[in-house]
């Protein structure tokens, strides 16, 4: 049994990191490995990781973690047994993805305006929630090559659009991911979509 | 929200033994080490024990060492301190703490052991 | 073992003056991947002691931005921006490079 694929592991900088890797071949991920990590700091202790299978050959192990700072390293040892596949180490600050935004909800009531509005993932005493910024996409159910992308750079985790920028009449969805530019994370995955009609009031035309 | 409460102290002759326990809540237990921490009246902290998570490793300040045990029942989310040969320089509160990062995150009220004939 | 040497042993101080209180350390708490093995503590009168400031210089939960942590090596100070009131207590640092965790003697911080 050999690792094909070493471990990569990203941090959601809260209380979990997930490592996925690949193996030589077809592996029961939870029956016969085992991923430990342990903090670097004096009297820590290591904890056990029950790997899941993610495809064949692919295992995906949820490190729990506490609230994460900069100076958090683990060391990661990965065993079949009593025997030691692979040993590395992981500094969750430096491979950041960010938790998918929640709650995304369109009010349509505000005159001719679309209000998309959704949740920070985080808590207000975690250091990311001051520190996302979001892509918001919105497509039409009907036209596939009516596809874009809002980025909102600011911290409010909203967007207002102009309803008559999109086509009257038709369904549309939206979905929303996140950010933090501060530890250069990865974006988030989309959030849930939601869906909604749009119509609104097309305005005279002047001849 | 985290809480460690100390319990067991009190009036006790030199030679004698006490055991003090710290019940902890509001945080997986078997997932930190833990340590005691004692407070002579008027004087400054002075570090006793610690234990891992597991239990499996304990940690002593060479003072203590053969005089003072510690041990932990994670199923009762519990820490101990076994305090035997008791001095009049063992008089002191007893504070629990919650270890994360080698420092301590959490602290306990403290148990007050008096030696005294 | 290490030495934990703080000072001044009482500091009075004016509400709403910065204070700093020093502690060195017999040998360097510095490790491996940059970070300082020092932290700091507060311990009001009748209560027991809370953290302020872990490895060296970052403040812990909970903890007004008033105090700072800073240092390397053998040489760290806490710094209170602005002293209030409720600050009064004693401060210790304690190092986390190896057991025995060692504390410094304490320095009392009381109002003028």
């Known amino acids: 049994m050999k690792v094909l694929q070493e471990p990569t592991c990203v941090s959601d900088y809260m209380s979990i990191s997930t490592c996925e890797w690949k193996m030589n071949g077809p592996t029961n991920c939870s029956t016969e490995l085992r991923l430990l990590y342990q903090l670097v700091f004096l009297l820590s202790e290591a904890h056990t990781c029950i790997p899941e299978n993610n495809g064949g050959a692919g295992c995906v192990c949820h490190l729990l973690m506490d609230d994460v700072v900069s100076a958090d390293n683990y060391t990661l040892d990965l065993w079949a047994g009593q025997q030691l596949l692979w040993k590395g180490s992981f500094k969750p600050s430096e491979h950041v993805k960010p938790r998918a935004p929640g709650n995304l909800t369109v009010h349509t009531n505000v005159s001719d305006t679309l209000l998309l509005t959704w949740s920070n993932p985080y808590p207000p005493d975690n250091y990311l929630y001051n520190h996302l910024t979001y892509a918001v996409n919105i497509w039409s159910e009907n036209d596939p090559a009516d596809f874009r992308i809002y980025n909102v750079t600011y911290l409010e985790p909203s967007l207002r659009i102009a309803a008559s920028t999109l086509k009257s009449g038709i369904s549309y969805r939206a979905r929303v991911r996140a950010w933090a530019q501060c530890y250069n994370t990865t974006w988030s995955e989309w959030s849930p979509s939601t869906k909604w009609h749009n119509s609104y009031r097309e305005p005279f035309e002047q001849h | 929200e985290v809480q460690l409460v100390e319990s067991g102290g009190g009036l006790v002759q030199p030679g004698g033994s006490l055991r003090l326990s710290c019940a902890a809540s509001?945080?997986?237990?078997?997932?930190?080490?833990v340590s005691w921490v004692r407070q002579a009246p008027g004087k400054g902290l002075e570090w006793v024990s610690a234990?891992?998570?597991?239990?499996?490793?304990?940690y002593y300040a060479d003072s203590f060492k053969g005089r003072f045990t510690i041990s932990r029942d994670n199923s009762k989310n519990t820490l101990y301190l076994q305090l035997n040969s008791l001095r009049a320089e063992d008089t002191a509160v007893y504070y629990c703490?919650?270890?994360?990062?080698?420092?301590?995150?959490?602290w306990g009220q403290g148990t007050l052991v008096t030696v005294s004939s | 073992d290490i030495v934990m040497t703080q000072s001044p042993l009482s500091l009075p101080v004016t509400p709403g003056e910065p204070a700093s209180i020093s502690c060195k350390s017999s040998?360097?708490?510095?490790?491996?991947?940059?970070?300082?093995?020092l932290d700091w503590y507060l311990q009001k009168p009748g209560q027991s002691p809370q953290l302020l400031i872990y490895?060296?210089?970052f403040t812990a939960k909970g903890v007004p931005d008033r105090f700072s942590g800073s240092g390397s090596g053998t040489d760290f100070t806490l710094k209170i921006s602005r002293v209030e009131a409720e600050d009064v207590g004693i401060y210790y640092c304690?190092?986390?490079?190896?057991?025995?965790?060692?504390f410094g003697g304490g320095t009392k911080v009381e109002i003028k």
């Open positions: 234990i891992g998570g597991s239990g499996g490793k304990t």
């Open positions: 490895l060296g210089s």
């Open positions: 304690m190092q986390t490079l190896q057991t025995p965790l060692t």
């Open positions: 703490a919650r270890v994360l990062r080698g420092g301590f995150w959490d």
């Open positions: 509001g945080f997986t237990f078997s997932r930190y080490a």
């Open positions: 040998q360097s708490l510095l490790e491996g991947q940059g970070y300082n093995r």
